[in-house]
Structures are given as structure tokens and as C-alpha cells.
Interface confidence: low
């Protein structure tokens, strides 16, 4: 059988190192070898690359070397493939070295902002060694954010030689960490070099972005003074490097400028200690470079009514993520503020919070959150400058068994009853919702038995026991996850009840 | 602390070879361009050329193309600088120094190593 | 190939003055020039980058000034520890190539 016509011939010029055409089939029944016929010089002359009969039958690829190579120049290549049968020739294909020449990346060897210009980086590179002289080149240069995946791409051509090679990539961010690769082509080419070595470079700083800011209001205290915590955080879209040299605060009562107290720090939280009228309290982060916007904050009078708007909310788990969505019947609220913190026996050390547009739901990742701890979420209504009653859940992102059981203690021991109590497990040692509790009990000798009540009963009474006997006796607090035992407790049933044995003296 | 230790002084007969090491501590030499500089008794810097440790790129001065070879060996993070073909002209302290591409500056060096060619 | 030329090549004030190193470049090379200085035995040390930039722990009275050919170091309020050689470099394009050289002797 004759071998295959070879179809799909595809050359490509890797410039100064060789000429390399490919075809198929790349694998034949029987054993085949294969012939390219090249005319080059413009026709002028031709030659033949033969594939090695020994080493490398049935490969469908062949390399012209230098010094026949000749640039500029059209190439006519045909491919003949032979066996023990017979020879089948290709079509013949026409080459045109230029648009056909693949080169060396490029070398970039410094990405740096310009003093004084914003938002850019000037990218400077090498040229690569192997490329014709003459030739203008094409560039793809892809960038991005340094914690993104995705790349941007911008295309441009430069026509110097043999210098080093500049690019202004502007509109980027301030202050923001970029990730930058280039390739380049000679502009005819129809083949791209491969990407340069990736190299980083940060644009310059500018004056802050802007903040979010936040209050937790406290109770009054016994003077009359309310303690407000501030808070504050760079804004959402500010760039990841941004950083404050400090933070000018300033605040007065509603309608009395008079009376504006100002404080500068260099923390993301302050507290004040306000009156029971209303307040309005400024906040601005400052560099070296300038200020940031104003953010505004409107503190309620003690007595203000605020305003009821989430009617229901539910905490869900997915795969990775904590999803908190909830009802509104306030169609205009469109912002809301997400607070999340610990729900511990002491003062929550970590406190977060998170403002939402434009949506009835709030998705945190799952590792952000600390399996086994309890999560008090709340969630406020914002409308303009009002802010109004929050509506809290708590959440789990992993349950686990508790890891201490309740403490058990047995009271009013009669013939055949008795009065369990156990204490809450600490919630530092819940470590998920408390499901349930189930009181194991066993008579020396005897059976098992359990009962298990809900998780808001603290005290159980046992009855139809044996009198005059042993018991031991344990309670189990189950999350999700399962159970854990508290303290394991004897008692014995009484002979007689104290009542009958009062009765019996008296005789 | 970020350092640059370069090896001892050399004496080298002309004609002969020498290599100099230079060890980079407290960065890895990977993320920056290493440059080697000399200077003659009395005389003033002449770059001879970088590498990029990350994949071995390297662009020499005109006048040390063929005659320089600089290498990395990233493992050990160290570069180095050879220098064939010595002759008298070539008496000089070479240097190593750091070029951190996004700050764009030889912020390190090293102590430098004296070459001496002499027969 | 770029050339850096330096003036003058030696200079001689006295503490308190303000000193003043010219460095012209032979085309272009924006603001990318950096300027080191050199004590006998020691390897230069960075003083200003990007024409103008103070490096780390510089003291300001080193300053750098100018863009595309011309390009001054100054440093005023001169000190006895200021001596050294003061060399300009440029990095716009390879080679990268350094000024003479400016000696700097305080009175």
C-alpha cells in the first residue's frame, strides 16, 4: 500500500537557527521515510531534507540549517513520503520567511513608576539578540495585579534597533503591585515569540482613597456619657499597598459647630464619649502626598426610634463560603452593614464588619472564619445618614463535638427518683449549636438507659428507679458533630422515702 | 542582613583566566539583576555587565562581549564573573552589585576582589 | 554608547558651604541617573536614584535635581565626612556607563 499523501505542511522560520517543517500523518502502517524538496533563493536554488532512515522513520517533522537560510526569501516546500511500495508527493506550499519568522522573547530589565506621573510604569526591555536588525517588531505586553489571575493585554510596535526598548503602561492603579510579561514578533509574523520573565513593579502612592467608617454604640454610662467606638478601614477598591500615615477625626454636636472637638491618631479605632444628642463625627486619612475624602458618620440622639426594617434572615453554609441572606420590607434601604465577631464569654477580641450595596446577602470565605467558634452576626439597615435596628443570627462555619461535657450534679435522691441539674457547657467549649442532652444511667449490674431532652433544659427528673440501689450516671451534650460525656456521678436510691421514715419515729 | 561576600584577592599570569564569586545573603538573587563593575587603580567605575539569575539572561558592556562570562548558581546563590584572555589593562578591583528592577538602583555591593595580572 | 560627563572633576569647600556636581549626558536618559559616592578602600554607596530620589537613610542635605541631559548633585551644609569621590550613572540604556568621577576635599 502506498504511504499517505502528506497534508498539512506547516513551516515555521526560528530565525537564525533553522527552518523546520512539520506534515501528516506523523505516523505511518508500515514503515515510511520522508523527503522535503525546498527551492529557495528566490527559486534559484533547491535542496533536500531527508528524514534518517535508521533513527527517524516515520517522523513527520524536518530542519533546514544554516548556512543555507537565507533571509528575506520565498521558500516552495513538497513533501514526499516513501515505503517499500511506492512514493506519494504533497501538494507543494509557499513560504514567505517573513511572516513565517519566530524570534527570542524579549528581556524586560526594570518596571518603575516616573516621579511626578501617576498611575503608570514605564516597562524597558531588551530587545532580543536573535532578531533581524531591520525589522520593526510587534509586542503583546500582559500585565495584572499581582493577587489576580487575570491578565490584561495591550498590543504596540517599535521600530528602533538595537537599544533598549521603553513602554508607558498607564491607567493602572495607584500604589498597586503589577505583574508584567512581554512577547514580540516581527510585525510580518504570523508566530510570537514565547514570554519573557515575568517582573514586578509598583505605581507611585498617591493621597488615600477614601474610607469606611463604622460605630459600635455602647450603653450609656453613669454620668450621662455614651461611649462610641469608631472604626475605620481603608475603602473597599483602595489600593491593596495603600497606607495611612495617620487619621485626623472631628465631631460636634448636631448644629453646634461651636463645639467640634478634633482628635488625630495613627489607630483604626477611637473612642469617644459623647452626650445623648445627636452627633455628626468626620473622619480623614492622611500621607505624605495629601488627604482623603471625607467619611461621615451620624451618631443617633439616646433617644432617637429607629427605624425596623429585616424581617427575617438565614445563615447558610456552601462548600467554601458562609452566605447570610436576608428579607427587607423597605424596598429603599439598598445598604446595610454586615458586623461579625466571636460570640466568647469575654469581650470579643476581634470585631468585623463589612458595608453591602445593592444586595440581601453577605458571603464571607470559610477559612476567614475560625472552625468550631461561634459567630454573632448582625446586620443594620442603612438609609441615607440613619441607621437602623439590626437583626442577628449566629453561625458555625464548623461544628465539632464539644470539648468538655456538662457538670452534673444529682439533687432530691428518693426511693425511685431523682433530680438531675447540669450547668451550660462554657461557650469557649461548645464548639457547635448544642442539639441536645441525653442523661445515660445504669444501675449496678443492670441495664443502660438514656433519655435525651432539648438543649434549653438544664434539669431532668428521673423516675420508675430501683430503691436501695446504685447508680452511675452521665449526661451527654451533642452538637452536629456528635456527643461528648460530662463528669460520670454515683448517687444510691433511698431504703425508704424521708417521708415514711419521719412517719415511722413518730410511732 | 542583605550582604554581598566576593572571593579573595587573584593574581593571575596574563592570558590566563580568573572567576570571581560574589554570595548574596538576606535576599534571594533570583528576584534582582546582579551587575559587575570594575575599576583600575585611580580610575573611575566601568560596568562590565548583569545577570538575570532567574534564567541566566545576560548583556555585557561592547568593549567585555567575548572575554566576560557572567553565571548564577541559584542554589547556592552566588554569581560569578570570568574573565579570559588577562593582560596588563585588566589590573583592577571588580565589584558585584544588586539591581533590585522595580526600585531600579545598585543598592548592593560587594567589597570588591582586587585582580592583579602580573608574570 | 551613552558618555557621562562630570564637572568639575575636583572640588574644594569648606564645612558649612554647599557643594555642586554637574553630570551631562550625551543624549537623553529622562531621569534615570543615579549618584553614588566612593571613600578610598570602600565599594561606592547609593545616595540618590531616579535623579532624585534620596535613598534610605540619606541625609537631606544631599539632593538631586534634572531630567533628559543635565543632571546636579548638591549637598549643602557640607561636612567633614562628605569627602569621597561622587560619581553620576545612567541606566536609560545599555551599557550602563558612570561619570569620571568628581573628587570631593573639604578645607
Known amino acids: 500500500v502506498l504511504p499517505a499523501k502528506p497534508e498539512n505542511i506547516s513551516c515555521i522560520f526560528y530565525y537564525e537557527e533553522n527552518f523546520t517543517c512539520t506534515w501528516s500523518p506523523e505516523k505511518e502502517a508500515s514503515y515510511t521515510w520522508y523527503k522535503v524538496k525546498r527551492t529557495y533563493s528566490y527559486g534559484y536554488k533547491s535542496d533536500i531534507c531527508s528524514t534518517d532512515n535508521s533513527t527517524r522513520g516515520n517522523h513527520a517533522s524536518c530542519s533546514f540549517l544554516p548556512p543555507t537560510i537565507t533571509n528575506p526569501d520565498n521558500y516552495t516546500i513538497q513533501v514526499e513520503a516513501q515505503n517499500a511500495d511506492g512514493i506519494m508527493k504533497s501538494d507543494i506550499t509557499y513560504w514567505n520567511l517573513d511572516a513565517i519568522m519566530k524570534i527570542e522573547p524579549p528581556e524586560i530589565f526594570s518596571v518603575k513608576s516616573v516621579l511626578g506621573i501617576k498611575r503608570m510604569l514605564q516597562i524597558k526591555w531588551i530587545r532580543p539578540v536573535l532578531a533581524p536588525h531591520s525589522s520593526t517588531l510587534k509586542y503583546t505586553l500582559r500585565f495584572r495585579t499581582i493577587n489576580s489571575a487575570y491578565w490584561m493585554e495591550v498590543n504596540f510596535t517599535k521600530e528602533d534597533i538595537d537599544r533598549d526598548e521603553t513602554y508607558n503602561l498607564t491607567e493602572l492603579q495607584a500604589f498597586t503591585e503589577y505583574v508584567m510579561t512581554l512577547r514580540c514578533a516581527p510585525a510580518e509574523s504570523m508566530f510570537w515569540s514565547g514570554w519573557s520573565q515575568e517582573k514586578v513593579g509598583t505605581t507611585e502612592e498617591e493621597a488615600p482613597y477614601g474610607l469606611d467608617l463604622w460605630r459600635v454604640l455602647k450603653p450609656a454610662m453613669v454620668d450621662g456619657r455614651r461611649p462610641v467606638q469608631l472604626m475605620w478601614k481603608k475603602a473597599t477598591g483602595a489600593p491593596v499597598l495603600e497606607k495611612a500615615l495617620g487619621y485626623n477625626i472631628w465631631y460636634f454636636p448636631e448644629n453646634n459647630t461651636n463645639l467640634t472637638e478634633t482628635v488625630n491618631t495613627t489607630n483604626q479605632t477611637h473612642e469617644l464619649y459623647l452626650g445623648g444628642k445627636t452627633y455628626w463625627v468626620y473622619v480623614v486619612s492622611y500621607n505624605s502626598l495629601g488627604e482623603s475624602p471625607v467619611a461621615t458618620l451620624r451618631i443617633p440622639a439616646l433617644n432617637e426610634k429607629t427605624f425596623q426594617c429585616i424581617e427575617a434572615m438565614q445563615a447558610c453554609l456552601t462548600q467554601d463560603q458562609l452566605v447570610v441572606e436576608w428579607q427587607s420590607s423597605a424596598p429603599e434601604v439598598d445598604t446595610w452593614m454586615v458586623e461579625w465577631f466571636p460570640d466568647v464569654d469575654s469581650e470579643p477580641s476581634s470585631f468585623s464588619w463589612e458595608s453591602v450595596s445593592q444586595a440581601r446577602n453577605w458571603t464571607i470565605q470559610k477559612d476567614e472564619l475560625k472552625p468550631l467558634w461561634c459567630y454573632n452576626i448582625s446586620v443594620y439597615p442603612v438609609l441615607r445618614d440613619r441607621v437602623g435596628q439590626p437583626y442577628s443570627t449566629q453561625a458555625y462555619v464548623q461544628e465539632g463535638i464539644p470539648s468538655a461535657g456538662p457538670v452534673t450534679q444529682a439533687d432530691s435522691i428518693g426511693v425511685k427518683t431523682v433530680t438531675i441539674t447540669w450547668k451550660e457547657i462554657p461557650k469557649s467549649k461548645r464548639n457547635g449549636f448544642i442539639k441536645n442532652y441525653t442523661i445515660f444511667y445504669q444501675a449496678e449490674d443492670g441495664k443502660e438507659f438514656s433519655k435525651t431532652v432539648n438543649s434549653n433544659i438544664l434539669q431532668y427528673r428521673l423516675e420508675s428507679l430501683t430503691r436501695r440501689t446504685s447508680y452511675s450516671l452521665q449526661v451527654m451534650a451533642s452538637t452536629n458533630a456528635g456527643g461528648t460525656n460530662g463528669t460520670k456521678i454515683n448517687f444510691k436510691t433511698l431504703s425508704i422515702s424521708h417521708h415514711h421514715h419521719h412517719h415511722h419515729h413518730h410511732h | 542582613e542583605v550582604q554581598l561576600v566576593q572571593s579573595g584577592a587573584e593574581v593571575k599570569k596574563p592570558g590566563a583566566s580568573v572567576k570571581v564569586s560574589c554570595t548574596a545573603s538576606?535576599?534571594?538573587?533570583?528576584?534582582?539583576?546582579i551587575h559587575w563593575v570594575r575599576q583600575a587603580p585611580g580610575a573611575g567605575l566601568d560596568w562590565i555587565g548583569r545577570?538575570?539569575?532567574?534564567?541566566?539572561?545576560?548583556k555585557y558592556a561592547p568593549k567585555f562581549q567575548g572575554r566576560a562570562t557572567l553565571t548564577a548558581d541559584t542554589s547556592t546563590n552566588t554569581a560569578y564573573m570570568q574573565l579570559s584572555s588577562l593582560r596588563a589593562g585588566d589590573i583592577a578591583v571588580y565589584y558585584c552589585?544588586?539591581?533590585?528592577?522595580?526600585?531600579?538602583?545598585?543598592?548592593?555591593w560587594g567589597q570588591g576582589t582586587l585582580v592583579t595580572v602580573s608574570s | 554608547d551613552i558618555v557621562m560627563t562630570q564637572t568639575p572633576l575636583s572640588l574644594s569647600v569648606s564645612p558649612g558651604e554647599t557643594a555642586s556636581i554637574s553630570c551631562k549626558a550625551s543624549?537623553?536618559?529622562?531621569?534615570?541617573v543615579t549618584w553614588f559616592r566612593q571613600k578610598p578602600g570602600q565599594s561606592p554607596k547609593l545616595l540618590i536614584y531616579?535623579?532624585?530620589n534620596r535613598y534610605t537613610g540619606v541625609p537631606d542635605r544631599f539632593s538631586g535635581s534634572g531630567s533628559g541631559t543635565d543632571f546636579t548633585l548638591r549637598i549643602s551644609t557640607v561636612e567633614a565626612d562628605d569627602t569621597g569621590v561622587y560619581y553620576c550613572?545612567?541606566?536609560?540604556?545599555?551599557?550602563?556607563?558612570f561619570g569620571q568621577g568628581t573628587k570631593l576635599e573639604i578645607k
Open positions: 538576606g535576599f534571594n538573587i533570583k528576584n534582582t539583576f
Open positions: 550613572q545612567q541606566d536609560y540604556s545599555s551599557p550602563w556607563t
Open positions: 552589585a544588586r539591581y533590585y528592577y522595580v526600585s531600579s538602583y545598585f543598592d548592593v
Open positions: 545577570i538575570d539569575p532567574a534564567n541566566g539572561n545576560t
Open positions: 543624549q537623553s536618559v529622562t531621569n534615570d
Open positions: 531616579s535623579a532624585s
